[in-house]
Amino acid sequence: SAPGEDEECGRVRDFVAKLANNTHQHVFDDLRGSVSLSWVGDSTGVILVLTTFHVPLVIMTFGQSKLYRSEDYGKNFKDITDLINNTFIRTEFGMAIGPENSGKVVLTAEVSGGSRGGRIFRSSDFAKNFVQTDLPFHPLTQMMYSPQNSDYLLALSTENGLWVSKNFGGKWEEIHKAVCLAKWGSDNTIFFTTYANGSCKADLGALELWRTSDLGKSFKTIGVKIYSFGLGGRFLFASVMADKDTTRRIHVSTDQGDTWSMAQLPSVGQEQFYSILAANDDMVFMHVDEPGDTGFGTIFTSDDRGIVYSKSLDRHLYTTTGGETDFTNVTSLRGVYITSVLSEDNSIQTMITFDQGGRWTHLRKPENSECDATAKNKNECSLHIHASYSISQKLNVPMAPLSEPNAVGIVIAHGSVGDAISVMVPDVYISDDGGYSWTKMLEGPHYYTILDSGGIIVAIEHSSRPINVIKFSTDEGQCWQTYTFTRDPIYFTGLASEPGARSMNISIWGFTESFLTSQWVSYTIDFKDILERNCEEKDYTIWLAHSTDPEDYEDGCILGYKEQFLRLRKSSVCQNGRDYVVTKQPSICLCSLEDFLCDFGYYRPENDSKCVEQPELKGHDLEFCLYGREEHLTTNGYRKIPGDKCQGGVNPVREVKDLKKKCTSNFLSPEKQNSKSN
């Protein structure tokens, strides 16, 4: 039978009455247009909603926007458009919400043609009040907050100037001209690229990378011949043009650009690209595009310095620069990532890694599913997950895969079961163990969200027709109840719940259409009365993550340690609550070869845990570049995986000697770098 229709599915008692008492409708006094929603702060209940409506006139477009505020998680909204003097807000800049619980909000206004600069509205009290500020420039990008100090803002102007404010946008100073890209680093540092000649586009590959650590008082050039740069974890990456030709290479710094090392990655040509797929303080996943318009490349994983890379996955689907990749970090279980590969026959298949890119495998076929028409063998096939690429192809996939750090082990995604990703209408699948096993959760495409740290999953069917029914599950998607939240169906546009999945409120957004008018409407449902009591100790059970063989002493060991979690029992209907903290008990494992990546010059043959020397490097001295000096590597082929905590057991020898020879690209060597003060 279909999921949720089994006899053993216990019904939540009196849920209709409980939810009816906690369903709040708000009709917005608005023509439809577009709507954007932002949460201000964490656990504050404050939501800002900006509706915009464009009326195309013959000569120009007339725009009108309205701003609404809720302080009870969307149950009630107040029109606060007068606080921003009924000004038309530019939606392309969105609402710039300050980091953490700063309560800061910046809205960028549309200004008339001849004005000297733009206009912003600033709030530092969770949008209770706004201050209008006229800018001495026209902004090109949204205001960017320093992660360390929300009073510090930076923005690029339409004239390519880099502007900084030290008092939350009250006063602005242009600290540099001819800037292409600017980013905040750590400790209020700003990194930016500049052009010398014509423009950012014309100087691509000849840009300079600058750094200021004092908001523009002084500068240091930390790289030249730059194509682009990026920050990931504690790594600063620069893509640098080679001296002789049009190829470029990745250089990496872990000291804010003072010293650089050349990453042991293939160089790329004009039509290729590098992309940082994921990065943390331990390591980075780097995609290197294949030559030609192939639509795929190779994933490499770095060592702890971001310098030595191991090939992780071949034929990784990534369409073009800035294009689509399905690479997804499964945040509900450490070490798990999902992505797609383009197989030799052009079909697309999903792969998963449980050990941070060490090994990739197909997803196990769900127990309750048949292999579809893509499968050659009807008994053997895999689950294939729809993500960004499928969405870009306009397949019937309303949402990307979903996981939340505090909903341990839960992954929800659209998928198909066969030999490859299918264009057939997908179903929704759930894993409760971080991707090891899967179950069909819902028939057909749905929108879905996680509430109360996994205590409730909410779903709405993806339909072109108006809807008035929401589905919810209190047992991680095994059984489903349906609730009719309104008599009058609405054209559904989105589900909204507070980021972090701790809330028990869900907002259903849509619009109603009558003969001549259409209006935005939201229904906010509070599930607090469904989960009547707070969870107690008896409601939780011990779960060993990454467990595949309970008989094995090393069962659950991933990256050198295993973790036991306290997880809510599926049968318990109770509140984890807003203050819920994931309880985990780590224990260190003995080292095995699985805890080591293959070192520079070595690779792992398929289905083998031993690293063997690359044939083309056999008998050669292994030398590589580190901090601008050439290093000689003595190794038996292994290096510890970044973040691996194993102790004892296997301990391969690894020694690095300084050859006292220069080796970085000359344009990144420290002597060439210069400083200047304003």
């Epitope: 052009n346 079909s347 893509t374 192809q393 264009v423």
Partner: antibody
Framework: QVQLQESGPGLVKPSETLSLTCAVS?????????WGWIRQPPGKGLEWIGS???????YYNPSLKSRVTISVDTSKNQFSLKLSSVTAADTAVYYC??????????????WGQGTLVTVSS | EIVLTQSPATLSVSPGERATLSCRAS??????LAWYQQKPGQAPRLLIY???TRATGIPARFSGSGSGTEFTLTISSLQSEDFAVYYC?????????FGGGTKVEIK
Amino acid sequence: QVQLQESGPGLVKPSETLSLTCAVSGYSISSGYYWGWIRQPPGKGLEWIGSIYHSGNTYYNPSLKSRVTISVDTSKNQFSLKLSSVTAADTAVYYCARGPPELGKMYFQHWGQGTLVTVSS
Amino acid sequence: EIVLTQSPATLSVSPGERATLSCRASQSVSSNLAWYQQKPGQAPRLLIYGASTRATGIPARFSGSGSGTEFTLTISSLQSEDFAVYYCQQDRKGPLTFGGGTKVEIK
């Protein structure tokens, strides 16, 4: 068993627009698959015109792209071809066909019986 | 675009004999090649896809082989109903293209 049936006028005047419909039975278009149009001038080989997903994503032959529109109507379980500014060179048997279920692959498993369209004044 | 060249244009074979049809691609199409059979007044019928996988209901006497640029369709023992025109088609890169066809006729 899926069946496809082309329909539309057998005679179209030069410079006008050729319009054909492919009715699908035995399978719901909205459930998936690629759907395509292929043509064959009398006594000649096959030429792919274009394909569409059930979701509306289209892929056209660049040589015809400026003149072709393929659309899908899931409510009627049919998909259509429009070819504008036709000339005598567009005279052919037009086939509709169903492609494979895999994303990124496009051969044709099921075909309609074809309909001859003659372009003549 | 990828050009598919089929040879021979006409193949004369006696019933019960083996027929070997060739399809050459102007650039690699990996294993993204399909074969169709078309009889006069009928629509094409899919025989092989993925260079070597037989479509549902296709007799075992039809087999496909090859990858990259050289492909072969083999009919191990020709039956009277096999006399027809055979087309190859690639779906490696857009636009999809067909070969010019090989006519298998009774010797």
